[in-house]
Interface confidence: low
């Protein structure tokens, strides 16, 4: 009589994450008598996945009634399946003894899986940068499989060019992880944009992954000023104007000088937004000019976002405004609105 | 101002399906992600994913199981939300929310209220 | 799933307590976490973003710390006008994830 032959038709069976995967064996004789067993696999360390006489194993099912006596069938069925169930797995026959010993084993069945990529995190950078300077994001997706994989960077729909990606690890792994950093110029009108990181994967069935990130996370577009004198609103009180245009984020503080003296020190509140997301405010300032013998040198100074103040100043000619009589307080006022 | 204008109250039979409108003004419609959230009475709130207007680029919630269809209409300023195979347990109040000047769920429409009744 | 878990989950208190909500977050969410309000049969409310940022309007008795996964949402001394549910949301990973929310009522 012929000699009993294990029989693993498939090399390799590929299922997708979440999904079983039956693993075919076969064998061609009832003779000898004994167990079948599967081990993940092969050596000292292989590892028991589903054993015929005892033990429990809730993931794995029998696909045809093993227990039968004229049964050679011994395919099994692995659920929920994860990216740690790759390897390959060896459907072994036992001669039954005390102890069982191992007679023969099939080839082998090769069992990998795909896995779907998580979805791209885009991280920018800790800081605040203004346009013109060149920042870096990062882009990370892991837990995928295969190891091929596409990933392209965007700026509004623009593709990126100027970025390095690394897939890890190098060698053989149940999953990998993909890490990727751009390299984009900021410029003024990025309040809007976004950058986004694009993973394709033979999983995805040609829907990519998109992760993203809002440079308005990531720029500061600091404010022109302009100072100007608005015509007299009433004898001896000139109007004073500090235009503070094109400044991103809202967070800003003004501070009025008169011959760098503080006047007054307020906050940006009802601001305009323009179409580019950056915003506009308008601080003004009422100078009694009867209240000063000589000429004001008065400066707005803005402080934006924490950083170090800018100023822009603006001289008011007292001379060219006549004095009221008997007047020795300074009448100032300020304010702001909505431009 | 921003502004973020929903729908009036529906009320669907079980299998039915809902389309939800939100109309924005006030800001660059194509400029930023429209989410929608749910809240079942009495519960908390439910993120059902995301469309981008620019490139109507769109984000889902796993767990609604392609039930969920998010679209925009350029045009008129308009985001649509459409739940499909609904069932008695959809009965919630649906809400538009914007991402603005880089703050997520900044402002949010009034809500449109859904019931699923047979 | 990134899971966001508030507590507590109802709260009592006065007028002029101090009262904190914490929200945990299963994993590390940097500071992509907001704050919201919300009063019955209405939208939620931003209440604060980025961990600590409160927008205009927002009065200062409200504040946020934290990083990581661990974030706290402080008023400093409560108001009639305070008494609603509050909701954390992380932004960190798809999908987004709201904690169950806190219901602080009058005591």
């Known amino acids: 009589e012929e000699e009993l032959q294990v029989i693993q038709p498939d090399k390799s069976v590929s299922v997708a994450a979440g999904e079983s995967a039956i693993l075919h064996c076969t064998v061609t004789s009832l003779i000898p008598v004994g167990p079948i067993q599967w081990f993940r696999g092969a050596g000292p360390a292989r590892e028991l996945i589903y054993n015929q006489k005892e033990g429990h194993f809730p993931r794995v099912t029998t696909v045809s009634e093993s227990t039968k006596r004229e049964n050679m069938d011994f395919s099994i069925s692995i659920s929920n399946i994860t990216p740690a169930d790759a390897g390959t797995y060896y459907c072994v026959k036992f001669r039954k003894g005390s102890p069982d010993t191992e007679f023969k084993s099939g080839a082998g069945t090769e069992l990998s899986v795909r896995a779907k990529p998580s979805a791209p995190v885009v991280s920018g950078p800790a800081a605040r940068a203004t346009p013109q300077h060149t920042v870096s994001f990062t882009c990370e997706s892991h837990g995928f499989s295969p190891r091929d994989i596409t990933l392209k960077w965007f700026k509004n729909g623009n593709e990126l060019s100027d970025f390095q990606t690394n897939v890890d690890p190098v060698g053989e792994s149940v999953s990998y992880s993909i890490h990727s950093t751009a390299k984009v110029v900021l410029t003024r009108e990025d309040v809007h944009s976004q950058v986004i990181c694009e993973v394709a994967h033979v999983t995805l069935q040609g829907d990519p992954l998109r992760g993203t990130a809002n440079l308005s996370e990531t720029i500061r577009v600091p404010p022109t000023l302009e100072v100007t004198q608005q015509p007299v609103r009433a004898e001896n009180q000139v109007n004073v104007t500090c235009q503070v245009r094109k400044f991103y984020p809202q967070r800003l503080q003004l501070t009025w000088l008169e011959n760098g003296n503080v006047s007054r020190t307020e906050t940006a509140s009802t601001v305009t937004e323009n179409k580019d997301g950056t915003y506009n405010w308008m601080s003004w300032l009422l100078v009694n000019v009867s209240a000063h013998r000589d000429d004001v040198k008065l400066t707005c100074q803005v402080e934006h976002d924490g950083q170090p103040a800018v100023s822009k100043s603006h001289d008011l000619k007292v001379s060219a405004h006549p004095k009221e009589q008997g007047s020795n307080t300074a009448a100032e006022n300020t304010g702001s609105n909505e431009r | 101002q921003v502004q973020l204008v929903q729908s009036g109250a529906e009320v669907k039979k079980p299998g039915s399906s809902v389309k939800v409108s939100c109309k924005a003004s006030?800001?660059?419609?194509?400029?930023?992600?429209i989410h929608w959230v749910r809240q079942a009475p009495g519960q908390g709130l439910e993120w059902m994913g995301w469309i981008y207007p620019g490139d109507a680029d769109t984000n889902y919630n796993q767990k609604f199981n392609g039930r969920v269809t998010l679209t925009a209409d350029k045009s008129t300023s308009t985001a649509y939300m459409e739940l499909s195979s609904l069932r008695s347990e959809d009965t919630a109040v649906y809400y538009c929310a914007i991402n603005y000047g880089g703050i997520w769920f900044a402002y949010w429409g009034q809500g449109t209220l859904v019931t699923v009744s047979s | 799933d990134i899971q966001m878990t508030q507590s507590p989950s109802s709260l009592s208190a006065s007028v002029g307590d101090r009262v904190t909500i914490t929200c945990q977050a299963s994993q590390d969410i940097g500071n992509k976490l907001i704050w919201y309000q919300q009063k019955p049969g209405k939208a939620p409310k931003l209440l604060i973003y980025?961990?600590?940022n409160l927008p205009g309007g927002v009065p200062s008795r409200f504040s946020g710390s934290g990083s990581g996964t661990d974030f706290t949402l402080t008023i400093s001394s409560l108001q009639p006008e305070d008494f609603a549910t509050y909701y954390c949301?992380?932004?960190?990973?798809?999908?987004?994830?709201f904690g169950q929310g806190t219901k602080l009522e009058i005591k």
């Open positions: 980025y961990v600590t």
């Open positions: 949301l992380q932004y960190k990973q798809n999908p987004l994830t």
């Open positions: 006030g800001y660059t419609f194509t400029s930023n992600y």
